[in-house]
């Protein structure tokens, strides 16, 4: 039924076909809202609705609480607090937003349907309340290439959501966008796992993500990266980590990204990028990087960053990029630093290195009465090292002696503690 | 020790245009962000825009933008804005301040701008 | 934009009394990025805790800040009459850049 998603089926007779003419005509039709087009209709014209129940459902039907258009191949089941996936969506469905749910979990084939879903390519499930996701969720949807997870607190994310089995190499999936900003759990929430760990082990399982061209990790609390994890997506073009908590890239390796344009990294913690970070993003031939707002810290280890940032074109804003630390540098432009600028200073605070320095001059007197009182004791101490020494020497002679008896073979037999 | 030294007070025609200065003084010039922000008597503050001396690049208020003009003179270390299209609701003190994303360190004395006919 | 939302609007305090402003933030602020500054009647604004929690160059120890995400909280923890002024909070974070609209702390 071209142009239109409609609960009831084709007519036979006239006024019917004339009705369905209209649905076509007005596009969205809800199933449920009662200010929508299809219920207005309905209530103008009473034997629409009275020759269309005595009808036997339509295979592309609209599912309760949801709104569809055939002609825009979209399904909207939005913010109507639904606790599980409608299983009756429209075969035609290429466009599938079920945001503002409850959905809780996401069971193994949640869109698995007779016939598939074939044509679905973009599902957005954000804000649902999502909090497990199993293996092989997003399974029999051989055209999904946009996904959205945003905004559900994932405790339990399967190492094969997206890959689907556990075999060490899957068919690869079909997704090309993965997004998957604010997904961290409270921290009360959280399994006793690293939370970057499953996330990675779900981006990584079975190689099923190779053609994946844009990761976004927004907003999860992320304190690293852990080093494999790009180097496995090797198709990615956009890479957005923004509003992280990382506070190195040390050791992220770019170098397999080759195909990489943006690389988000706004809203971290990042306080210096080094030599080998710089010299892999600046290999990256269509690469730009954001970097605004990070608590950079402009002492001699910014020395390499700064020079890199004068001459490259890769960073956008550069020129916004201040010093956060020290003190005496906090809102230095970057850019305007130059080596003289980044010393590296003793980064004790006053306080702390008067109280050093004090540390220092007792520990230093005490040593000094202890070299005082040994140089004025020197006989006694020598007196004492010469019995020291006589008393080692008779032990010794008498060790040896008992050494050589257990040595000899004919003396076997004797117990080796027996006085000889 | 740093200080930023503002223009004059100005009385302006209703459509006419002002240009204000801040002069930069106790620090180098190019290092630092000047930001410009307004306050209305008995109001609160409102940024502007702000400047990159060093780099030239300028980020306005899209309130503000086409009718604020930020530029800088790094060899006299002076910031400048120019208002154009006044109106009575630009009757206010204008001030610049030199600091960044950790706050702005330093305000110079404002400028006060009153557009009457 | 970021809206930032300050309370109370005016506040009065005794001497020696604690004093807590507060400044709520429409959408969420990193920390390192909100500010606030002190205004006297007549006088240009000055920083007065920057980066939320950091006191600015010749603040008394009895101010304090803290705050994350979209609440933030300045504190005074004995009200004195050089305290009495208007305190704006400030966000760098977000352009364009915001304030709020200020509190007026009087003395009572």
């Known amino acids: 039924m071209p142009g239109g998603c409609s609960r009831g089926p084709a007519a036979g007779d006239g006024r019917l076909r004339l009705a369905r003419l209209a649905l076509v005509l007005l596009g969205w039709v809800s199933s449920s809202s009662p200010t929508s087009s299809a219920s207005s209709f309905s209530s103008s014209a009473p034997f629409l609705a009275s020759a269309v129940s005595a009808q036997p459902p339509l295979p592309d039907q609209c599912p309760a609480l949801c709104e569809c258009s055939e002609a825009a191949r979209t399904v909207k089941c939005v913010n109507r607090n639904l606790t599980e996936v409608p299983t009756d969506l429209p075969a035609y469905v290429r466009n599938l937003f079920l945001t503002g749910n409850q959905l809780a979990v996401l069971p193994a084939g949640a869109f698995a349907r007779r016939p598939p879903l074939a044509e679905l390519a973009a599902l957005n499930l954000s804000g649902s309340r999502l909090d497990e996701v199993r293996a092989g969720a997003f399974e029999h949807l051989p055209s999904l290439r946009q996904l959205d997870l945003s905004h559900n607190p994932l405790a339990d994310l399967s190492p094969f959501a997206f890959s689907g089995s556990n075999a060490s190499v899957s068919a690869p999936s079909p997704l090309v966008e993965l997004i998957l900003n604010h997904i961290v759990p409270p921290e009360d929430e959280r399994q006793n796992r690293s939370f970057e760990g499953m996330v990675v082990a779900a981006l990584l399982a079975g190689r099923a993500l190779q053609g994946l061209r844009r990761l976004e990790l927004a907003s999860n609390h992320f304190l690293y990266l852990p080093r494999d994890v790009l180097a496995q997506l090797p198709s990615l073009r956009h890479l957005d980590l923004s509003n992280n908590s990382l506070v190195s890239l040390t050791y992220v390796s770019f170098r397999n990204l080759t195909h990489l344009e943006s690389l988000h990294l706004e809203d971290n913690a990042l306080k210096v990028l080094h030599n080998g970070t710089l010299a892999e993003l600046q290999g990256l031939p269509h690469i730009r990087v954001f970097l605004d707002n990070n608590p950079w810290v402009c002492d001699c280890h910014m020395a390499d960053m700064v020079t890199w940032l004068k001459e490259t074109e890769v960073v956008q804003g550069k020129d916004r990029l201040t010093c956060a630390y020290p003190e005496k540098m906090r809102n230095r432009v970057l850019l305007e630093l130059n080596s003289a600028d980044l010393d590296c200073d003793p980064i004790l605070p006053p306080s702390l290195q008067t109280s050093y320095v004090f540390l220092g001059i007792v520990l230093a007197l005490i040593g000094a009465i202890f070299l005082l009182v040994l140089y004025l004791n020197r006989k006694g101490i020598k007196k004492w090292m010469h019995n020291i020494r006589d008393a080692c020497r008779d032990h010794m002679e008498g060790y040896h002696y008992r050494y050589e008896i257990n040595a000899d073979p004919r003396l076997t037999n004797l117990s080796s503690n027996s006085d000889v | 020790q740093v200080q930023l030294q503002q223009s004059r007070p100005e009385l302006v025609k209703p459509g006419a245009s002002v240009k204000m200065s801040c002069k930069a003084s106790?620090?180098?010039?190019?290092?630092?962000?000047i930001s410009w922000v307004k306050q209305r008597t008995g109001q609160g503050l409102e940024w502007i825009g702000e400047?990159?001396?060093?780099?030239?690049?300028?980020y306005y208020n899209e309130k503000f933008k086409g009718r604020a003009t930020l530029t800088a003179d790094k060899s006299s270390s002076t910031a400048y804005m120019q208002l154009s299209s006044l109106t009575s609701e630009d009757s206010a003190v204008y001030f610049c301040?030199?600091?960044?994303?950790?706050?702005?360190?330093?305000w110079g004395q404002g400028t006060t701008l009153t557009v009457s006919s | 934009q970021i809206v930032l939302t300050q309370s109370p609007a005016i506040m009065s305090a005794s001497l020696g009394e604690r004093v807590t402003l507060t400044c709520t933030a429409s959408?969420?602020?990193?920390?390192?990025?909100l500010h606030w500054y002190q205004q006297k009647p007549g006088s240009s604004p000055k920083l007065w805790i920057y980066?939320?929690?950091n006191l600015a160059s010749g603040v008394p120890a009895r101010f304090s800040g803290s705050g994350s995400g979209t609440s933030y909280s300045l504190t005074i923890s004995s009200m004195e009459a050089e305290d009495a002024a208007t305190y704006y909070c400030?966000?760098?974070?977000?352009?364009?850049?915001?304030f709020g609209a200020g509190t007026k702390l009087e003395l009572k």
């Open positions: 301040a030199m600091g960044g994303n950790y706050g702005f360190d330093y």
């Open positions: 106790g620090y180098t010039f190019t290092d630092y962000v």
């Open positions: 400047i990159y001396p060093g780099s030239n690049s300028i």
């Open positions: 959408s969420s602020v990193n920390s390192n990025y």
């Open positions: 980066s939320t929690s």
């Open positions: 400030h966000q760098y974070h977000r352009s364009p850049l915001t």
